[in-house]
Amino acid sequence: SGTTNTVAAYNLTWKSTNFKTILEWEPKPVNQVYTVQISDRSRNWKYKCTGTTDTECDLTDEIVKDVNWTYEARVLSYPAGNVESTGSAGEPLYENSPEFTPYLETNLGQPTIQSFEQVGTKVNVTVEDERTLVRRNNTFLSLRDVFGKDLIYTLYYWKSSSSGKKTAKTNTNEFLIDVDKGENYCFSVQAVIPSRTVNRKSTDSPVECMGQEKGEFRE
């Protein structure tokens, strides 16, 4: 059987944030469907999103099994209504994805400032430790659990009345900064993995300012 009505997928792209990982590709199908395969650690091909008319496939469940592994996927093209059809060489048309190593490449999601508390001239700022879909012993691991000390946070803070920013860094999810008494400050944080070569930084968190309900003030 021929493949006259099928075209190979192209522009295969990994979209991954905090290990939530989707493979995207083109084109939109016309009279054809797609099936995705992903290689596991034994280099076996596992079928996902069989016979889909979507141009994306959520592969999170597979990649979280070992985030340090380097995965490869491929998208197979079949004529609509005949997922068993093969090309002239006895194989469906397929296109390979780039390799993808989740630990090194997943984007760091936008962090959130969980709380800030002022005690005198010190402010303790805590960053929310976001839960990922990576599991160990039947529990979901947080971003810190997965990345450990590879992950740092940068805090940007400034007086509400001025634009001059200061920065602090931490290897944990907490900061303790000095502030001027009687001044309100605004805060934003960024997640960073300094050892990476790509996707080193997240976008900045939403800005939180003192005098709003997220904070707490104590003399």
Epitope: V146, G148, K169, T170, N171, T172, L176, I177
Partner: antibody
Framework: QVQLQESGPGLVKPSQTLSLTCTVS?????????WSWIRQHPGKGLEWIGE???????RYNPSLKSRVTISVDTSKNQFSLKLSSVTAADTAVYYC??????????????????WGKGTTVTVSS | EIVLTQSPGTLSLSPGERATLSCRAS???????LAWYQQKPGQAPRLLIY???SRATGIPDRFSGSGSGTDFTLTISRLEPEDFAVYYC?????????FGGGTKVEIK
């Protein structure tokens, strides 16, 4: 007060696997610290082997990575070191240590502030 | 890897004297990640200084650390008999964490 105690065989044959355990007492292994292994060759300086977080997240010295496995058992409050294919060059005093966050300049950074007494491992047939 | 070079290898001094120990890094190290340890014969190392200049809990104020970038210094203002030991600098910012080769402070 947290204390660490290394245990394991003092003599290992060449090509075998060195296995050591560090027992944490006086505190929980799951309390936000990291746990490290360091060794010191006879009369020499210190060499960091690797570290683990209670979640199982590890970092290893690249020079030893192919031979090293560090694991944690939170139920026993222990963490362990396995070093495979040992040679005489692996003869050393092996220390376990706790990495604790210390405040510095607005943030918190980890330092090895509690160490075990060390255990001597000799590789010899 | 970041190589830390300590000098001198041995420092021969008398009690009451000032000791100045140097640690030079092969590439820049953030002060946040620089520590000093003391080790006595048959004992494990003990954390003295973290963040290049902050004293660890229980460390006497005769110990002080300074420096930034690639050059760091540990100073013992007046040597006490219990200070004669080997001192190591360590960086914990880049894997592998590395230690200097050590400086032995001995009684003259």
């Amino acid at each position: 007060q947290v204390q660490l105690q290394e245990s394991g065989p003092g003599l290992v044959k060449p090509s075998q696997t060195l296995s050591l355990t560090c027992t944490v007492s006086g505190g929980s292994i799951s309390s936000g610290q990291y746990w490290s292994w360091i060794r010191q060759h006879p009369g020499k300086g210190l060499e960091w082997i690797g570290e683990i977080y209670y979640s199982g997240s590890t970092r290893y010295n690249p020079s030893l990575k192919s031979r090293v496995t560090i694991s944690v058992d939170t139920s026993k409050n222990q963490f362990s070191l396995k070093l495979s294919s040992v040679t005489a060059a692996d003869t050393a005093v092996y220390y376990c240590a706790r990495d604790t966050p210390y405040y510095y300049d607005g943030g918190y950074y980890y330092y090895m502030d509690v160490w075990g007494k060390g255990t001597t491992v000799t590789v010899s047939s | 890897e970041i190589v830390l070079t300590q000098s001198p290898g041995t420092l021969s001094l008398s009690p009451g004297e000032r000791a100045t120990l140097s640690c030079r890094a092969s590439q820049s190290v953030s002060s946040s990640y620089l520590a000093w340890y003391q080790q006595k014969p048959g004992q494990a190392p003990r954390l003295l200084i973290y963040g290049a200049s902050s004293r660890a809990t229980g460390i006497p104020d005769r110990f002080s650390g300074s420096g930034s970038g690639t050059d760091f210094t540990l100073t013992i203002s007046r040597l006490e008999p219990e200070d004669f030991a080997v001192y190591y600098c360590q960086q914990v910012g880049v894997v592998p964490y590395t230690f200097g080769g050590g400086t032995k402070v001995e009684i003259k």
